[in-house]
């Protein structure tokens, strides 16, 4: 058993039919010693008597808010929550396993530029009874300083037959050097309590391999004088970092007819124009990514032909 | 500790084309060594990320763009000091600072050539003979180093005379890949900023 | 005292469906989640199926997959296992069982497909 | 499709140790806990060993398990004639999970 944050306990359990469950001593935070009973959650059963109370917790029906009272008095309060271990591996029953870029991927970060700043997202099913807490830190053994707002709901979309809500933070590193190589990666913790069960999840990577730019802006067309070829022209994302000589970006540029089975043609370039071939009905779109090192394209940008 | 923005001749930079060589061939080395590799830990979420030229060099404070002299976390330098004098450098006007910038690359780049060729020799006595490093990214690393032309020491080939742990060199392989690659990538920045410049 | 007894094995013609039961008792069914595992006949154990605790979550191994189908009813406290489209391959004991550390099985069901 | 890998047959006299090997890879044994399972002929599987090492109770001390990087062992110290059975060892993938992933399995012989 571990304290969560004041008067929240987390009990860890070994998951399985008929398991003997954990002995828990809970202790009234009081100087009486005497006349006092124990009541969990709203029923006015007594549990027991005395300044301490031993409960053996087995199940969800053991968990919950357990309440130390003397005449009619609330003393104190002492809630219990459940940590599932199922054959050796915690349980993962809140969030969904959203299998991009691998399986059992339950949060997913990204960053619009090498500032240090990044936003986590999760999904879940679960509409209520829910609270997310978020901690993180550059490493691990000597952890560095980032800071994190509050999750919010950010998202919410019918699947099937379920609804499934999207929460996302935004954390930021306190002392971060967009030019700086990074060798202690980023590590992201969750803690999740649906009713009286706790899980928490982490994810831990390098800031340069969850960039992702926003598209390129201002995407303009100008045809060229006698000849169905268009300049395309666009210019890099605001919210890439400075300078754009040292953090520089590629370009892919792609023709769409309004059919998505026409053959799509692509070019790239480290350059902000191309010059490409406009089709009637076609559209051009553009996205970008660091010109060094590999991590996820941006949207695309696009603008019609016509 | 920070570039200028200074304003070279024209087609001043021929390593801006080596430098592109350099990221090219490391990365696909390093792709080499996981895909070979697969059942030794070699992924960038399994390795220690080590960095061989930790308080040797200072390539990344030194070769800071102007712009981000201001932001403070870029600031937290050691003192290095360089040789300088570099035929990359095509241009008087080009400062101080500039070169102990390029002279930091060129002892980054002699330090992990010391190394892989270190490695390939313990690899070239495995007899799994299961992997060796590319003798194209080693060409391209010493292409680099004459491109920027400094005066240095030569670091003697290290050698050992104890029996190769092979499962370990392997491992060294990927964990300087993965270092080198981060190097490299820092590199090109570099010389597309001065290129610009 | 856990206890997990199978129904609903026999003999089946390739291509025609079956279902399989497992009746649970002794233990809160609805807070763990339950596999389907099979041995083919002189062969090893292989894993079939698993289903959560709350039947939300499903997860197949990729010989039976688009062909079985794991549900439970947690008010009768029974796990199913409807096979369809069977194959001579799926020829073996079916046992059911919890998921944990410590795991309780089924007595097995024999499923023979033959024509 | 079997990725634990497992001698197909062991043997020993009584009063011998007996040991059955159970190898595997990174993401699998390397990550995750392993068990052991006893069957005997036209029964279920018996738990022997769960969390690499641990004995489930009424399980006799003579059986013990062991896990070193992405391998397993089972060790039978005094095998009796009663242990002569099928064994198999049990993991989880990192990128499967729940599925089972079971050994190959390892005839034990009590000459």
């Known amino acids: 058993i571990w304290e969560l944050k004041k008067d929240v306990y987390v009990v860890e359990l070994d998951w399985y039919p008929d398991a003997p469950g954990e002995m828990v001593v809970l202790t009234c935070d009081t100087p009486e010693e005497d006349g006092i009973t124990w009541t969990l959650d709203q029923s006015s059963e007594v549990l027991g008597s005395g300044k301490t109370l031993t409960i053996q917790v087995k199940e969800f029906g053991d968990a919950g808010q357990y309440t130390c009272h003397k005449g009619g008095e609330v003393l104190s309060h002492s809630l219990l929550l459940l940590h599932k271990k199922e054959d050796g591996i915690w349980s993962t029953d809140i969030l969904k396993d959203q299998k991009e870029p691998k399986n059992k991927t339950f949060l997913r970060c990204e960053a619009k530029n090498y500032s240090g700043r990044f936003t986590c997202w999760w999904l879940t099913t679960i509409s209520t009874d829910l609270t997310f807490s978020v901690k993180s830190s550059r490493g691990s053994s000597d952890p560095q300083g980032v800071t994190c707002g509050a999750a919010t709901l950010s998202a919410e979309r019918v699947r099937g037959d379920n609804k499934e809500y999207e929460y996302s933070v935004e954390c930021q590193e306190d002392s971060a050097c967009p030019a700086a190589e990074e060798s202690l990666p980023i590590e992201v913790m969750v803690d999740a309590v649906h009713k009286l069960k706790y899980e928490n999840y982490t994810s831990s990577f390098f800031i340069r391999d969850i960039i992702k730019p926003d598209p390129p802006k201002n995407l303009q067309l100008k045809p060229l004088k006698n000849s169905r070829q268009v300049e395309v022209s666009w210019e890099y994302p605001d919210t890439w970092s400075t300078p754009h000589s040292y953090f520089s970006l590629t370009f892919c540029v792609q023709v769409q007819g309004k059919s998505k089975r026409e053959k799509k043609d692509r070019v790239f370039t480290d350059k902000t124009s191309a010059t490409v071939i406009c089709r009637k009905n076609a559209s051009i779109s553009v996205r970008a990514q660091d010109r060094y090192y590999s991590s996820s394209w941006s949207e695309w940008a696009s603008v019609p032909c016509s | 500790r920070n570039l200028p923005v200074a304003t070279p001749d024209p087609g001043m930079f021929p390593c801006l084309h080596h430098s592109q060589n350099l990221l090219r061939a490391v990365s696909n080395m390093l792709q080499k060594a996981r895909q070979t590799l697969e059942f030794y830990p070699c992924t960038s979420e399994e390795i220690d990320h080590e960095d061989i030229t930790k308080d040797k060099t200072s390539t990344v404070e030194a070769c800071l763009p102007l712009e981000l002299t201001k932001n403070e976390s870029c600031l937290n330098s050691r003192e290095t000091s360089f040789i300088t004098n570099g035929s990359c450098l095509a241009s008087r006007k080009t400062s101080f600072m500039m070169a102990l910038c390029l002279s930091s690359i060129y002892e980054d780049l002699k330090m992990y050539q010391v190394e892989f060729k270190t490695m390939n020799a313990k690899l070239l006595m495995d007899p799994k003979r299961q992997i060796f490093l590319d003798q194209n990214m080693l060409a391209v690393i010493d292409e680099l180093m004459q491109a920027l032309n400094f005066n240095s020491e030569t670091v003697p080939q290290k050698s050992s005379l104890e029996e190769p742990d092979f499962y370990k060199t392997k491992i060294k392989l990927c964990i300087l890949l993965h270092a080198f690659r981060i190097r490299a990538v820092t590199i090109d920045r570099v010389m597309s900023y001065l290129n610009a410049s | 005292q856990v206890q997990l007894v199978q129904s609903g094995g026999g003999v089946v013609q390739p291509g025609r469906s079956l279902r399989l039961s497992c009746a649970a008792s002794?233990?809160?069914?609805?807070?763990?989640?339950m596999h389907w595992v099979r041995q083919a006949p002189g062969k090893g154990l292989e894993w079939v199926a698993f289903?959560?605790?709350?039947?939300?979550?499903?997860y197949y191994a990729d010989s039976v997959k688009g062909r079985f189908t794991i549900s439970r009813d947690n008010s009768k406290n029974t796990l199913y296992l409807q096979m369809k489209s069977l194959r001579a391959e799926d020829t073996a004991v079916y046992y059911c069982?919890?998921?944990?550390?410590?795991?309780?099985w089924g007595q097995g069901t024999m499923v023979t497909v033959s024509s | 499709s079997y990725v634990l890998t497992q001698p197909p047959s062991v043997s020993g006299t009584p009063g011998q140790r007996v040991t059955i090997s159970c190898s595997g890879g990174?993401?699998?044994?390397?990550?995750?806990?392993v068990k052991w399972y006893q069957q005997l002929p036209g029964t279920a599987p018996k738990l022997l060993i769960y969390g690499n090492d641990q004995r489930p109770s009424g399980v006799p001390d003579r059986f013990s398990g062991s896990k070193s990087g992405t391998s397993a062992s089972l060790a039978i110290t005094g095998v009796q004639a009663e242990d002569e059975a099928d064994y198999y060892c049990q993991s989880y993938d990192r990128g499967t999970h729940p599925a089972l992933l079971f050994g190959t399995g390892t005839k034990v012989t009590v000459l």
């Open positions: 002794g233990f809160t069914f609805s807070s763990y989640g």
């Open positions: 289903i959560r605790y709350d039947g939300s979550n499903k």
């Open positions: 990174r993401s699998n044994i390397g990550k995750n806990t």
């Open positions: 069982k919890t998921h944990g550390s410590h795991d309780n």
